[in-house]
């Protein structure tokens, strides 16, 4: 969960309570058990288009 009173993390990053800062979702490839990686899995890393109108 995001710390109260902090700005949301930018796209492609997620809040780490352990480190008390936003962390890059890309680093979850190397360190998948990091606390912030749960937040990364919840949203796609890049926008995608629906296949229907």
């Amino acid at each position: 969960e995001q710390a109260p009173g902090t700005a949301p993390c930018s796209r492609g990053s997620s809040w780490s309570a352990d480190l008390d800062k936003c962390m890059d979702c890309a680093s979850c490839r190397a360190r998948p058990h990091s606390d912030f990686c749960l937040g990364c899995a919840a949203a796609p890393p890049a926008p995608f288009r629906l296949l229907w109108p």
């Epitope: 492609g12 352990d18 480190l19 962390m23 890059d24 979702c25 890309a26 680093s27 490839r29 190397a30 360190r31 058990h33 890393p45 890049a46």
Partner: antibody, heavy 120, light 111 residues
Framework: EVKLEESGGGLVQPGGSMKLSCVVS????????MSWVRQSPEKGLEWVAE???????????HYAESVKGKFTVSRDDSKSRLYLQMSSLRPEDTGIYYC??????????WGQGTSVTVSS | DIVLTQSPASLVVSLGQRATISCRAS??????????MHWYQQKPGQPPKLLIK???KLDSGVPARFSGSGSGTDFTLNIHPVEEEDTATYYC?????????FGGGTKMEIK
């Protein structure tokens, strides 16, 4: 402010040994991967060794092929210190040795470096 | 090992113009989502400093005149407009697999 400070460099004869140290402040040391990277005019920037964190597979270590069996990287999380024990040193091991801290991938935090010269 | 080839080895750029530096990897360093390529700046007598991570993400405090792009095997660092303080050597580095390797560097001078 994050600070990494290397020490232990100097002049050593071929075949000799040397131990480098790096003290880290301003960083939750125990959570960060640490590496040694060296730089010389001949070889440019060359990654030497890495030690991961205790929570990730018991502080796994990795080495460049050129230093395997010669160099040993270790860490003391209670002192926020990183070490590089070097043995059987050769002239090609000469260079500036940097201590680096990073969570993963990109190398965020660099020390100022310590110079190692292997010469008779 | 993944070999990173930078070009040019050196360049001279006029103040206010654009500088473009390329880095080519001997194999892909990208997934469908992220590229594991990073850029560093090194000034004489100083350690390298992280500029851009994951091909295009500026590190904190890095001026917006720096930008990175690319995926797969081809990556580019752009600086525009170039300022005098940008005189330095620039390196790419991958974190796809061990051993981590660096490019040979591009030395940039400003005229």
């Amino acid at each position: 402010e994050v600070k990494l400070e290397e020490s232990g460099g100097g002049l050593v004869q071929p075949g000799g040994s040397m131990k480098l140290s790096c003290v880290v402040s301003g960083l939750t040391f125990s959570r960060y991967w640490m590496s040694w990277v060296r730089q010389s005019p001949e070889k440019g920037l060359e990654w030497v060794a890495e030690i991961r964190v205790k929570s990730d597979n018991y502080a796994t270590t990795h080495y460049a092929e050129s230093v395997k069996g010669k160099f040993t990287v270790s860490r003391d999380d209670s002192k926020s210190r990183l070490y590089l024990q070097m043995s059987s040193l050769r002239p090609e091991d000469t260079g500036i040795y940097y201590c680096i801290g990073y969570y993963a991938d990109a190398m965020d935090y660099w020390g100022q470096g310590t110079s190692v010269t292997v010469s008779s | 090992d993944i070999v990173l080839t930078q070009s040019p080895a050196s360049l001279v750029v006029s103040l206010g113009q654009r500088a473009t530096i390329s880095c080519r990897a001997s194999q892909s360093v990208s997934t469908s989502s992220y590229s594991y390529m990073h850029w560093y700046q090194q000034k004489p007598g100083q350690p390298p400093k992280l500029l851009i991570k994951y091909a295009s993400k500026l590190d904190s405090g890095v001026p917006a005149r720096f930008s990175g792009s690319g995926s797969g095997t081809d990556f580019t660092l752009n600086i525009h407009p170039v300022e005098e303080e940008d005189t330095a050597t620039y390196y790419c580095q991958h974190s796809w697999e061990i051993p981590w390797t660096f490019g040979g560097g591009t030395k940039m001078e400003i005229k």
